[in-house]
Every structure is written in C-alpha cells, then in structure tokens.
C-alpha cells in the first residue's frame, strides 16, 4: 500500500500591485497535480504582518488572495496543499510547507518619516490628512502622499497640498467616490538632496474618521409645569440622521446640571420654577449603527433663556 | 478586449542585443505568469522564458540561459525580454505569451501576441 | 528534457471528415499536454490544456484525450477554417517542450 503524497504549491509569491498595503498572494498548482484530478484540491493559507502574534488563515480552492498589510512591517506567508479525505482513501493529506516574504526595502532612518499623521472626515464629505516633518530634516525635504481603496484604478496623488515655509504639511482630499467601508491605503513619502526619508504607510476606514458638523437650530418647548424638552436638528451634509448620536450639556444658573448622551435629536428636562436662566450646547457624533469609531463634532451654538417664563415662550434661535 | 502587442524585434548582427516588450491590455496583469516562445523559420515552436506573476520565480530554456533576461513591470503591464550574445540560430518570431491560469494546470500559453521578427545576420 | 514527438507532419483532408492527431511524450506528464492551431501569418491559438479541457470559446468538435505519454486531439468534422498547423505542448514541468506540428492541409 503506497504512501499517498502531494507536493507543495508551486511559485507562491506575494505580489505588491502598488495599492499601498493591498497585496495579492499567489500560487501554482503543485506539480503532478493531474493524478488528483477527480479531486477538488484545496490549499491552507497562513500570513501575518511580520512580529504579530498570530496568523490570519484561509483554506481555499483558488490561486490566489488578496488582503491589506501594513507596509511599515514585512509580510511573512506560508501555504500548502490539501487532499480532502475523499481523495484519499481516508485521511485528509497535507503537502509540505511553501514559505515566503515580502517586505518594502526601508529608505532613511525612522526618524526621518512624517510625523504626528491626522486624518479626519469632515462632515462624511471631505477628507483632510495632516503631518508634520520628519525631526532633523531640512527645508528642502518635501512630502508627498498617495493613496488608493478599492475601485480605484491605480494610486493617486494628492493634487491639492497644504504647505508650511514651503513644505508640504497636508492633503485636502477631492470627492472620493464609493470610498467608504472599506479599506483606505496611504503612502506619505518624501524626497530630500541631503538624506533618504522613510516612507510611512496608513490604513484606516473612512467612516471611523468622521467628525460631522454640530447639531443645528436648538429650540425650548415647555412641556408641563417641570418638563423642558430641548430639540436641535441633524447638520447639513450627507449623514443621516440614523447615524448619529448626541452628547447635551445644559447649564442652569451657571451650574453644569446635566451632561447626557442620547440618540434622537431630543431631549427632555425636569426644571423648577425658580430656574432663571437655561442653556444648552449639543455635539454630534457617528453612532455605532455606522461605524466603528468617530469624531465628536464642535459644540453646537449655546441657546439660552434667560428670565423670562418658560411657560409662555418657546424659544428660537 | 485581452490583448498582447510585442515591439523591439528588428536586423541585429551576430553578438548584438536587442530589447523586446510586449504591452498587456485587458486584464489583470498582475495576477498572471508570462512567457516568450519563439517560432523559428522552420515553424518550430521554442519555449524561451517564463516571468512569475509577481517576478520571484524565473525560468530559461538552456539555449538562452546566460544570455536572455526576462523582466516585468507590473506598475506599466509591460513584459521585457533583453537578448544579448544573440546567434543566428536565435532569428525567430518571438512571441509574448500569458500562462493560463487554472486550478489543475498553468504552463501552458491561452493568449498570445501578434509577434515580432528578430534575424540574426551579418 | 521531455520530447514530444507529434505525428503525422502532415495530413489531407475533406470537409465533414474525422481527423485524428497523435503526440507521444518521451516520460510520463500526467494530463499535462495543450493543444495549439496556428493558422498562417497567425499566433498560436489554444485549443485544449490539461489533455481534455477545452479553451474558452473553442467549437465542440475539437476534443483532447490521453495521460501518461500517449495523447491524442481529435476534430469530430473538418470545417473549412479548420486548415491549420496543430502543435502539442506539455506543461507538466520546465523546460516546456512542443511537438513539431501537424499541418492539416485540403484533399
């Protein structure tokens, strides 16, 4: 009775198309392959980012895989072939490991990258990343930035630089079309006479970097004798109003009374009749329904009444 | 519409060079191996290079090894093959060709160029 | 190196009739044989790899068969724009080898 053996895939790279961290991992068929035919072979994939704890695995029938890495690290990745038990009379049988890397060769020394990277998502509508230089580098180092997601067909450049004596500082975005939920690449490389500077790669979601304008036209409605029901409007601008939650802070009398977080653009109040005068601010932010993470906007325009009855007024700002 | 188009072939004399491309349209460069096979004048077909995917794995026919380099640049779809040393029993029309890609096999060619002519004469 | 010895060099034949090509690899190659058409001034056009799988496109009538050493493509009915030159490939491991090529030519 024979041993039953595969070999290992055949020609496994890691192949950079230039999507700044999107790689694709690719394979052959391992040779003699034509014996199994009858058989769907399978493969086990493993890869990490060099010095993380844990592999990422996948068990598939194609050739290929694609996921995003952190360019700042190596990528290591192994994979072998599978013969599922039907094939085999029995037991499922494993190739050999096939083995390989890919790391991006780093250009000057750390300290020479962009330093303090900020981006953020103003309104759902614009995005604005900012940096400031690497330590020790001259005037004469410039930066660039480019990025790629998914429906892109190639990495772009920043067309519109916000500059610092002459250095570019940060990118004003244009529309970014379909850019949400899903994986947003950033390469910031720079270019000096004098030394290498290192290039710093960025991965993040668009949706988590939102920070939407405050809430507008915060209005007082007396409710009852001791309810006050704060209202306010969702911001202009793309989110709806599903997305976002609230943060209140309601001074009565100079005393912070209440600071409360809350899903609709209500609010109600339990006042006294000896309240003389009541304000309120408002911030909004993304709520978890449609992202991960988010930004608080600035506080909205404090809207106050001041001395006069509640119960006659409602108040407009 | 995949396509293949190879450029740079032309009259080269004994122990000359000569640098063809071939430019790659249609499809997911990247993501396939390439090749050049050569037809001689006696319609011979002559497997000559293979270029991986991603470039970590290159392979030579020994009439060429030592001589010809096969090169890619997934950034441009281009493909490259730099004769050197050329004889002249390197006159053939080369062709760029890409490696099919299938769950069972991948070595053998399902598109292929129009071809470019390299004589090798004095 | 594997060889592989395509017979015949060449053949005549009619419209309508069943035409049978044969390559014979120098070891054995599993099921890794293709089967190419050039057509004069042409490219090489893949008609079948893997011995039996026929290439996207390709008319049923031309079908592949065969593992080990002995492989055969087999065109059911000759159609006028089936005159060509037929070559076999194995794809089994490097180097790649072709056989010399059939030139199926009118009766």
């Known amino acids: 009775d024979t041993e039953i053996k595969v070999n290992p895939p055949q020609d496994f790279e890691i192949v950079d198309p230039g999507y700044l961290g999107y790689l694709y991992l690719q394979w052959q068929p391992p040779l003699s392959l034509d014996h199994f035919k009858e058989c769907t072979v399978e493969y086990e994939l493993k890869y990490r980012n060099i010095g993380s704890e844990t592999w990422k695995t996948i068990i598939t029938k194609n050739l290929h895989y694609k996921d995003g890495f952190d360019l700042n690290k190596g990528i290591e990745a192994k994979i072998h072939t599978l013969l599922p038990w039907q094939c085999t009379n029995g037991s499922e049988v494993q190739s050999s490991w096939a083995e390989t890397t890919y790391w991006i060769s780093p250009q000057g020394i750390p300290e020479t990258k962009v330093q303090d990277m900020d981006c953020v998502y103003y309104n759902w509508q614009y995005l604005l990343c900012s940096w400031k230089p690497g330590i020790g580098v001259l005037l004469d180092t410039n930066y660039n930035l480019f990025y790629w997601y998914e429906g892109l067909d190639h990495a772009l450049q920043c067309v519109d630089y916000i500059k610092a004596d002459g250095q570019n500082i940060g990118c004003r975005f244009p529309y970014l079309e379909a850019s949400d939920y899903k994986d947003f690449y950033i390469c910031v490389n720079g270019s000096s006479e004098n030394k290498p500077i290192r290039s710093s790669y960025f991965t993040f979601q668009l949706q988590n970097i939102v920070k939407p304008l405050p809430p507008v036209y915060l209005t007082f409605t007396r409710e009852s004798s001791c309810e006050i029901k704060l209202k306010w409007s969702i911001p202009l601008g793309p989110i709806p109003a599903r997305c976002f939650d609230y943060e209140i802070e309601i001074r009565e009398d100079d005393t912070t009374l209440v600071t409360a977080t809350v899903e609709n653009e209500t609010y109600t109040l339990k006042t006294t009749n000896e309240t003389r005068q009541l304000c309120f601010v408002v911030r909004s932010k993304v709520n978890i329904y449609c992202s991960d993470d988010g930004i608080w906007s600035e506080w909205s325009d404090k809207q106050c009444w001041e001395g006069e009855d509640l119960s006659k007024k409602t108040l407009l700002r | 519409e995949v396509q293949l188009v190879e450029s740079g072939g032309g009259l080269v004399q004994p122990g000359g060079s000569l640098r063809l491309s071939c430019a790659a349209s249609g499809f997911t460069f990247s993501r396939n191996g390439m090749s050049w096979v050569r037809q001689t004048p006696d319609k011979r077909l002559e497997w000559v290079a293979t270029?991986?995917?991603?470039?970590?794995?290159?392979y030579y026919a020994d009439s060429v090894k030592g001589r010809f380099t096969i090169s890619r640049d997934n950034a441009k779809n281009s493909l490259y093959l730099q004769m050197s040393s050329l004889r002249a029993e390197d006159t053939a029309v080369y062709y760029c060709a890409r490696q099919g890609t299938t769950a069972l096999a991948t070595r053998f060619f399902d598109v292929w160029g129009q071809g470019t002519l390299v004589t090798v004469s004095s | 190196d594997i060889q592989m010895t395509q017979s015949p060099s060449s053949l005549s034949a009619s419209v309508g009739d069943r035409v049978t090509i044969t390559c014979k690899a120098s070891?054995?190659?599993?099921?890794?044989v293709a089967w190419y058409q050039q057509k004069p001034g042409k490219a090489p056009k893949l008609l079948i790899y893997s011995a039996s799988y026929r290439s996207t496109g390709v008319p049923s009538r031309f079908s592949g068969s065969g593992s080990g050493t002995d492989f055969t493509l087999t065109i059911s009915s000759l159609q006028p724009e089936d005159f060509a030159t037929y070559y076999c490939q194995h794809h089994y491991s490097a180097p790649w080898t072709f056989g010399g090529g059939t030139k199926v030519e009118i009766k």
């Open positions: 270029v991986s995917s991603g470039g970590s794995y290159i």
């Open positions: 070891q054995d190659v599993g099921t890794a």
